[in-house]
């Protein structure tokens, strides 16, 4: 049985203000049981970007259908990009816990930066 890997293929993503950015994340296993969340930054001050289970994230949509069985694609789209969105984004697998889920493995991160505005 292979150990779970979190794959974020892009190290750097250049985005344009006002456009939509796609952050890719795939996993190699359904196990261990537990959710995948997206964060910007690391450590205790990191910002939660998307949690399907709870919270309101009006600018974030999932690339895969939320009703897809045994989904291993946890990519997201962030719309209406602003300069405040720059930073490094991590998809993070949590192991199901009771009562609290426990962080299990993080992807390597994708740095989102502003690209030159097309002329």
């Amino acid at each position: 049985e292979e150990e779970l890997q979190m794959i974020q293929p892009e190290k750097l993503l250049l985005v344009t203000v006002g456009k939509t950015a796609t952050l890719h994340c795939t996993v190699t296993s359904l196990l261990p049981v537990g959710p995948v969340l997206w964060f910007r930054g690391v450590g205790p001050g990191r910002e939660l970007i998307y949690n399907q289970k709870e919270g309101h994230f009006p600018r974030v949509t999932t690339v895969s259908d939320l009703t897809k069985r045994n989904n291993m694609d946890f990519s997201i789209r962030i719309s209406s990009i602003t300069p405040a969105d720059v930073g490094t984004y991590y998809c993070v697998k949590f192991r199901k816990g009771s009562p609290e889920n426990v962080e299990f493995k993080s992807g390597p991160g994708t740095e989102m930066a502003l690209g030159a505005k097309p002329s």
């Epitope: 049985e1 399907q52 009703t67 199901k96």
Partner: antibody, heavy 120, light 108 residues
Framework: EVQLLESGGGVVQPGGSLRLSCAAS????????MTWVRQAPGEGLEWVST??????YYADSVKGRFTISRDNSKNTLYLQMNSLRAEDTAVYYC???????????????WGLGTLVTVSS | EIVLTQSPATLSVSPGERATFSCRAS??????LAWYQQRPGQAPRLLIY???IRETGIPERFSGSGSGTEFTLTITSLQSEDFAVYYC??????????FGGGTKVEIK
């Protein structure tokens, strides 16, 4: 075709032990969480335990008495039941988990069940 | 623990008629709800997941609806093989996974 076949049920005295097995075929066993669900005679369904890879989860009613495990090389799920009580009398079903909506599991295939009777 | 309450406990329906029964959750489970059918002497069978998606091979006469705390399973034009017990199950917040107490659909 997915198949789940439970075995190991029987009659046991209160305080006794039993080990249930569930032989799985027709899918990549090691890739999926697996679950035990039980049904007391004439009653509804009660979740007992779930195992992922190394992660295990138990209903409060069996915690500390039952142990779920798996042998991926044998495609087999187990439930070790100790300190059995009369209220553990039930048909025990093994079920394959399926995941949807980024987390959360339901059970898409079930075995036929094995009856455990705890009685003196 | 999320409690699921199914109603009615028993539903008497004539073959060919429509059957509708409900599952109410004690707190919001979004769409994380499944429905199972259990015929006498058999194991449960998955019918619906994500509140409304029919499992492969399940006839179109079975449909699920609802979200949040109120869910409904509808069987249009009941066939003889549909007389069984139906259970809902939530997978939004676990452990524990919880099931409703079941609705028995019997021949009128």
């Amino acid at each position: 075709e997915v198949q789940l076949l439970e075995s190991g049920g029987g009659v046991v005295q209160p305080g006794g032990s039993l080990r249930l097995s569930c032989a799985a075929s027709g899918f990549s066993f090691s890739n999926f969480a697996m679950t035990w669900v039980r049904q007391a005679p004439g009653e509804g369904l009660e979740w007992v335990s779930t195992i992922g890879s190394g992660d295990t989860y138990y209903a409060d009613s069996v915690k500390g008495r039952f142990t779920i495990s798996r042998d991926n090389s044998k495609n087999t799920l187990y439930l070790q039941m100790n300190s059995l009580r009369a209220e553990d009398t039930a048909v025990y079903y093994c079920a394959k988990d399926s995941t949807v909506s980024w987390s959360g599991d339901f059970f898409d295939y079930w075995g036929l069940g094995t009856l455990v009777t705890v009685s003196s | 623990e999320i409690v699921l309450t199914q109603s009615p406990a028993t539903l008497s329906v004539s073959p060919g008629e429509r059957a509708t029964f409900s599952c109410r959750a004690s707190q919001n489970v979004k769409n994380d709800l499944a429905w199972y059918q259990q015929r006498p002497g058999q194991a449960p069978r998955l019918l619906i997941y994500a509140a409304r998606i029919r499992e492969t091979g399940i006839p179109e006469r079975f449909s699920g609806s609802g979200s949040g705390t109120e869910f409904t399973l509808t069987i249009t034009s009941l066939q003889s093989e549909d007389f069984a017990v139906y259970y809902c199950q939530q997978y939004y917040d676990w452990p524990p996974f919880t099931f409703g107490g079941g609705t028995k659909v019997e021949i009128k």
